[in-house]
């Protein structure tokens, strides 16, 4: 089972690993040459710090936290990454016209530290 600890952020509200949404155009994403729609995407991503045991994804993340405290120069702190994703469908350009294509790893659904 995943050893995920509490959501209380010791650094203050909004400072720890969390889901963040950024509105981006196809041009911002570099997709304008192959995607037709949607023209704007609400990109959900994971940002924030991973202090001791905060949203630890597993025991490895807990170990990493402990070792980072002891050897911060050689062991990095856990990183805030997606725990799961929301699927998304895009209307794409093709050689013959347009098509629908689904992607299951574009948008973060929730976040954890690993």
């Amino acid at each position: 089972a995943r050893a995920r600890n509490g959501d209380h952020c010791p650094l203050g509200p909004g400072r720890c690993c969390r889901l963040h949404t950024v509105r981006a155009s196809l041009e911002d994403l570099g997709w304008a040459d192959w995607v037709l729609s949607p023209r704007e995407v609400q990109v959900t991503m994971c940002i924030g710090a991973c202090p001791s045991q905060f949203r630890a994804a597993n025991r490895h993340a807990q170990i990493k936290t402990s070792l980072h405290r002891l050897k911060p120069d050689t062991v990095p702190a856990p990183c805030c990454v997606p725990a799961s994703y929301n699927p998304m469908v895009l209307i794409q350009k093709t050689d013959t016209g347009v098509s629908l294509q689904t992607y299951d790893d574009l948008l973060a659904k929730d976040c954890h530290c690993i």
């Epitope: 037709l36 729609s37 949607p38 023209r39 704007e40 609400q42 929301n86 699927p87 998304m88 469908v89 895009l90 209307i91 347009v98 629908l100 689904t102 299951d104 948008l107 659904k109």
Partner: antibody
């Protein structure tokens, strides 16, 4: 409040043409795709196709490609489904539905338009 | 023949728990999400569950969805008379785009 209001029931003869409508309100019409779904009498749901009202890009189910035309007029927040030559087998309830933000599900549905084709 | 397979009918008494299955393949449910819709008699379908296990606001927590491998299921606990309806699963298929199950008629006994 998000609403999709469809045009009224139609009774047509085989070979006639028809265009039914779906007017969106309560949201930015060009920000969400619109899909059309068929339900034949006593049967299940069948996806027909999708339109992006902003760029008018359309994609059809292979089963409906060439059988119907989907279009939209973003100036009046309305999507359309049309036939150039109806058949008796087109008798069904037709629903328009708005896609959710990620284009993977239908979050709001119109009330349906019943199309009856009979000689 | 639907790409997604559902039982034609299920039934249960008020207060009971019922489940509706939706079986697919590695080209649809196996790789992506499942959504569920409720269609009450004489009305349009309504979104019940999206992305496998998420409920839109306003849908009671008596309804829940899950997915495992190439199958998904909808569970309804504390069955009520007003739950009598047709239920459809829907997913994405690499060849047909958006696909629906054939639908399941839920009868509330008594």
């Amino acid at each position: 409040e998000v609403q999709l209001v469809q045009s009224g029931a139609e009774v047509k003869k085989p070979g006639e043409s028809l265009k039914i409508s779906c007017k969106g309100s309560g949201y930015s019409f060009t920000s969400y795709w619109i899909g059309w779904v068929r339900q034949m009498p006593g049967k299940g749901l069948e996806w027909m196709g999708v339109i992006d009202p902003d760029g008018s890009y359309t994609i059809y189910s292979p089963s409906f490609q060439g059988q119907v035309t989907i279009s939209a007029d973003k100036s009046i927040s309305t999507a359309y489904l049309q036939w150039s030559s109806l058949k008796a087998s087109d008798t069904a309830m037709y629903y328009c539905a708005r896609y959710g933000r990620y284009g993977t599900y239908f979050d709001y549905w119109g009330q349906g338009t019943l199309v009856t084709v009979s000689s | 023949q639907s790409v997604l397979t559902q039982p034609p009918s299920v039934s249960g008494a008020p207060g009971q728990r019922v489940t509706i299955s939706c079986s697919g393949s590695s080209s649809n449910i196996g790789v992506l999400y499942v959504n569920w819709y409720q269609q009450l008699p004489g009305t349009a379908p309504k979104l019940l569950i999206y992305s496998n296990d998420n409920r839109p606001s306003g849908v009671p927590d008596r309804f829940s969805g899950s997915k495992s491998g190439t199958s998904a299921s909808l569970a309804i606990t504390g069955l009520q008379a007003e739950d009598e309806a047709d239920y459809y699963c829907q997913s994405w298929d690499s060849s047909s785009n958006y696909v629906f199950g054939g639908g399941t008629k839920l009868t509330v006994l008594g």
